[in-house]
């Protein structure tokens, strides 16, 4: 490409006319501000193409870049073009006008930028200032481009003097944008709502300043659009939030709500979804069954736990034998209901060092205005067995009797056993079980009584021994679900003068 005059910089007089010519081996065209001004194109006999641009009645606004480029770049070097910069000093034009977007300069990293304030006269002295400051900033100036350097997030103006008149440019605003990989979080005020209540969702992006939110939701699919609201969380820098609010939810609003966020600077994107359930009315549901008979061991602590789901949040009460329970000041009973997730609860009744009196009928009631559950169970206090008495007697009938009395809850079983060889028993020889009906030498009689007040069973068992011819170790063992207890007595024949 050949341009005449060759430039690269020309200074022309205002109101004059000037002709620019460009020629090349293929069709050529002049461009000014990305447009093709009126020009004359021709093809010479030698096959050379040319274009003539005539600039008439020049003004300062004709100041700027002019390019000559190939009209059809097929098969040619696409980047071949010639640049010419023309100044038309014009005292009536201060700074050349900018498009609105040129006044706002956005940065995503610390980098050199240009504040594009340009004048029509290359001889003018131009200075750069902060908008509210008089001090000229030490930034190099190029009359064809403007001030280039690294700038802070501020507002700037350029100044020059034309004759005796000081001229200010428009203000330029530099913004350093925070741009990072997008991290979206979506949450809802409630993920479960009753019909008629509101659905409110929030989509928050951290680390970016300019993003675009797009929501998809069940209502949108049926053509009913909801306008989200976007705001900036002032107390948290670079937090942008989009709020989707659906008043008076319907059952059809149940489903997946997705927030899609795009950031156009680096073309990043992320999306998160959340499920919303709209229920016709509130509910209570149990997660797991509690047996209708529960056990606790005397003097031990016992926690009874109920896990349930409810919406709206319920009131939880515990009762014993139809009387309301509360945390006891003595620390014998502790009640707690924890909200372990939005709609899930764990309610616990803890009995500290269980007493017999704490046996009874317990009910947990969880309720709200729509629904309830009453969970009931009987609490049985298990008491380890104790042998309270083991005694031997010699009735006149000649037989010998051994009486064993013990208590416990649940009902104890009684086991009688005897050992005839005192030296070797019970270590070497196992004791013989007594009381089997087949054995004629012993008879057994057992009575069981339930003591309502103490809530435990008493077992009284009498062993009748028909003839004892040598010392005999008789053992009474009581056993129930929570333990066993044993006592032993030596029974001697009538004829022997001593008893152990």
């Amino acid at each position: 490409l050949v341009v005449t005059p060759p430039g690269p910089e020309l200074v022309l007089n205002v109101s004059s006319t000037f002709v620019l010519t460009c020629s090349g081996s293929a069709p050529v065209v002049w461009e000014r501000m990305s447009q093709e001004p009126p020009q004359e194109m021709a093809k010479a006999q030698d096959g050379t193409f040319s274009s003539v641009l005539t600039l008439t009645n020049l003004t300062g606004l004709d100041t700027g870049e002019y390019f000559c480029t190939h009209n059809d770049s097929r098969g040619l070097e696409t980047d071949e073009r010639k640049r010419l910069y023309i100044f038309v000093p014009d005292p009536t034009v201060g700074f050349l006008p900018n498009d609105a977007e040129e006044l706002f300069i956005f940065l995503t990293e610390i980098t050199e930028i240009t504040i594009p304030c340009r004048v029509t006269d290359p001889q003018l002295v131009v200075t750069l200032h902060e908008k509210k400051g008089d001090v000229a900033l030490p930034v190099p100036y190029d009359h064809q481009r403007g001030f280039s350097g690294i700038f802070e997030d501020r507002s700037y103006i350029c100044k020059t003097t034309i004759g005796d008149r000081e001229v200010d440019s428009d203000a330029y605003y530099v913004y350093r944008l925070q741009v990072s990989s997008i991290n979206v979080s979506v949450n809802a005020v409630q993920t479960v709502v009753r019909q008629g209540e509101n659905i409110t969702l929030m989509c928050i992006v951290i680390g970016n300043e300019v993003v675009n939110f797009e929501w998809t939701y069940p209502r949108k699919e049926s053509g009913r659009l909801v306008e989200p609201v976007t705001d900036f969380l002032l107390d948290m820098p670079y937090h942008i939030r989009s709020i989707l609010h659906i008043p008076s939810a319907e059952l059809e609003d149940s489903g997946t709500y997705t927030c899609n966020v795009t950031e156009s600077v680096n073309d990043h994107q992320d999306e998160k979804a959340i499920n919303i359930t709209v229920v016709e009315s509130g509910y209570v549901r149990l997660l797991g069954e509690v047996g209708t008979l529960q056990f606790a061991e005397l003097h031990r602590s016992r926690t009874l736990q109920v896990v349930f789901e409810a919406y709206p949040p319920p009131t939880v009460l515990w009762f014993k034998d139809n009387r309301t329970l509360g945390d006891s000041s003595a620390g014998e009973i502790a009640l707690s209901t924890r909200n372990v997730s939005e709609t899930r609860y764990v309610s616990e009744l803890t009995l500290v060092r269980v007493k017999v009196a704490e046996a009874g009928h317990y009910t947990m009631r969880a309720f709200h205005e729509d629904a309830e559950v009453q969970l009931s169970f009987q609490l049985q206090i298990n008491v380890p067995v104790r042998v309270l008495e083991l005694s031997e007697s010699h009735p006149d009938s000649g037989e010998q009797t051994v009486r064993c009395r013990g208590r416990g809850m649940p009902q104890p079983n009684i086991i009688w056993s005897a050992c005839r060889d005192l030296k070797r028993c019970p270590r070497e020889l196992p004791p013989t079980l007594l009381g089997n009906s087949s054995e004629e030498e012993s008879q057994l009689e057992t009575n069981v009584t339930y003591w309502e007040e103490e809530q435990e069973f008493e077992v009284v068992s009498t062993l009748r021994l028909q003839h004892v011819d040598r010392p005999l170790s008789v053992r009474c063992t009581l056993r129930n679900a929570v333990g066993q207890d044993t006592q032993e007595v030596i029974v001697v024949p009538h004829s022997l003068p001593f008893k152990v």
């Epitope: 509910y283 149990l286 997660l287 069954e289 047996g291 559950v373 969970l375």
Partner: nanobody
């Protein structure tokens, strides 16, 4: 698959009583939470009462509490709703429902199996 058949509905004067029964077949009854729901003319179906698998947990809609009693007999595969002091606003079709999902629930959507319903009409 569980089939549920309700019975015991009918016409009764205000203040009277009815006992609804629901018999299940085709499944292990004791593994289902059972519920009674009702639907009055022109209204949505609503929870009335529910009972857990072992009968240890029960619950009622506030407006029927103290008047209705739910119970079950796992040996007979039957759940009952004893309705006393009936009011005209209790008029509805009463549906029996079974839930495998939870041991007890008042939420209609938790119930997998439904009966055809039995009409209860309370005249004033």
């Amino acid at each position: 698959e569980v089939q549920l058949v309700e019975s015991g509905g009918g016409l009764v004067e205000a203040g009277g009583s009815l006992r609804l029964s629901c018999t299940a077949s085709g499944g292990t009854f004791s593994t289902y939470a059972m519920g009674w729901f009702r639907q009055a003319p022109g209204k949505e179906r609503e929870f009335a009462a529910a009972i857990s698998r072992n009968g240890g947990s029960k619950g009622y809609k506030e407006s029927v509490k103290g008047r209705f009693t739910i119970s079950r007999d796992n040996a007979k595969n039957t759940v009952y709703l004893q309705m006393n002091s009936l009011k005209p606003e209790d008029t509805a079709v009463y549906y029996c429902a079974a839930s495998r999902t939870y041991t007890y629930s008042t939420a209609m959507k938790d119930y997998n199996y439904w009966g055809q319903g039995t009409q209860v009409t309370v005249s004033s």
